[in-house]
Interface confidence: low
């Protein structure tokens, strides 16, 4: 018969014949022959392959280096890589999460729009009129100015984006 020019799914063409690919979690040791099947071996303890493959070496699991602020979020298996994330208060510098940086704080005059996660940094927003933030924080939102009226007080000093209003007693002489 004519040697094949293409193979079925989960097969590969070598020496004019179709050999089975190794399943995820295993690596290729030797190609099949006319008389023998493809020979595969399981990946080692700290290694993985996540696809049907003909790789002769498994991939090393990612190392979540604590020196870079990383910790294991999900332990790798023979078929999956380790997933790293950052320690509390830190976030990944990239999608691959190769290192971590401290969460950004929002300066006075800015509040937290979105609190940081293990993979995204703090998102800050300027405090709009009627709101303020007088601290540098990775958690605090902009606070509304105090409503002097609800306390039967009057505004003695106007608020800014960094300071609250100052309330004082009403002038009793006023009609």
């Amino acid at each position: 018969p004519e040697p094949p020019t293409a193979c079925r799914e989960k097969q590969y063409l070598i020496n004019s014949q179709c050999c089975s690919l190794c399943q995820p979690g295993q690596k290729l040791v030797s190609d099949c022959t006319e008389f023998t099947e493809t020979e595969c071996l399981p990946c080692g303890e700290s290694e993985f392959l996540d696809t049907w493959n003909r790789e002769t070496h498994c991939h090393q699991h990612k190392y979540c280096d604590p020196n870079l602020g990383l910790r294991v979020q999900q332990k790798g298996t023979s078929e999956t890589d380790t997933i790293c994330t950052c320690e509390e208060g830190w976030h990944c510098t990239s999608e691959a999460c190769e290192s971590c940086v401290l969460h950004r704080s929002c300066s006075p005059g800015f509040g937290v729009k979105q609190i940081a996660t293990g993979v995204s940094d703090t998102i800050c927003e300027p405090c709009p009129v009627g709101f303020f933030s007088n601290v540098s924080s990775a958690f605090e939102k902009c606070h509304p100015w105090t409503s002097c009226e609800t306390k039967d007080l009057v505004v003695q000093q106007a608020g800014t984006n960094k300071t609250d209003v100052v309330c004082g007693p009403q002038d009793r002489l006023r009609a």
Epitope: V29, G44, S46, Q60, H61, D65, A96
Partner: antibody, heavy 119, light 107 residues
Framework: EVQLLESGGGLVQPGGSLRLSCAAS????????MSWVRQAPGKGLEWVSS????????SYADSVKGRFTISRDNSKNTLYLQMNSLRAEDTAVYYC????????????WGQGTLVTVSS | DIQMTQSPSSLSASVGDRVTITCRAS??????LNWYQQKPGKAPKLLIY???SLQSGVPSRFSGSGSGTDFTLTISSLQPEDFATYYC?????????FGQGTKLEIK
């Protein structure tokens, strides 16, 4: 032709620091795992550290963990080993070695650079 | 850590001899075993990887076998340039460990 050329070795006092470099040529540096392996005078081989190709993950021998840092600059085709808090037992020839992708055997080696830690 | 133990530590042989060096792992390492040759003052050279795969450019008189915990490096007919120290190394898991070496000397 694959070539690995180490530099940066020398005499350093205990507690001191040294940075080794390994200039690579003749292959696509970024596609390969790179490692440091050392050999104390008259002794056998000891794996020190590896840095993998994908996300640049790293591994260290317990004897150097927290003191040594492996890194790579793919734009310069260069591997580094930053060695801090050096001890007398770190005295050795340090070899830079290449391994395929994420693999953990060493198919090409540099000629080595001698690090001597002594007062 | 996985301990690698080679035997013998040293060996005297003559040109043309068949020589066998063994390497034992302290736990099963499947076929993740590699062999290196090192000559005095030189860097090691990879001979065999994955227990039995011959590295490109290495003479066919070198062969490797074994799986699990017991492995063998065989030189079918010793040549003058084969007198050197041989190391096994496991690549099953970190820390990657080497055997203590086998020094092959001329008888």
């Amino acid at each position: 032709e694959v070539q690995l050329l180490e530099s940066g070795g020398g005499l350093v006092q205990p507690g001191g620091s040294l940075r080794l470099s390994c200039a690579a040529s003749g292959f696509t540096f970024s596609s390969y795992a790179m490692s440091w392996v050392r050999q104390a005078p008259g002794k056998g081989l000891e794996w020190v550290s590896s840095i993998y190709s994908g996300g640049g993950g790293t591994s260290y021998a317990d004897s150097v963990k927290g003191r040594f840092t492996i890194s790579r600059d793919n734009s310069k085709n260069t591997l580094y080993l930053q060695m801090n808090s050096l001890r007398a037992e770190d005295t050795a020839v340090y070899y830079c070695a290449r391994g395929p992708a994420y693999s953990s055997f060493f198919d090409y080696w540099g000629q080595g650079t001698l690090v001597t830690v002594s007062s | 850590d996985i301990q690698m133990t080679q035997s013998p530590s040293s060996l005297s042989a003559s040109v043309g001899d068949r020589v066998t060096i063994t390497c034992r792992a302290s736990q099963s390492i499947s076929s993740y075993l590699n062999w290196y040759q090192q000559k005095p003052g030189k860097a090691p050279k990879l001979l065999i990887y994955a227990a039995s795969s011959l590295q490109s450019g290495v003479p066919s008189r070198f062969s490797g076998s074994g799986s699990g915990t017991d492995f063998t490096l065989t030189i079918s007919s010793l040549q003058p340039e084969d007198f050197a120290t041989y190391y096994c190394q496991q690549s099953y898991s970190t820390p990657y460990t080497f055997g203590q070496g086998t020094k092959l000397e001329i008888k």
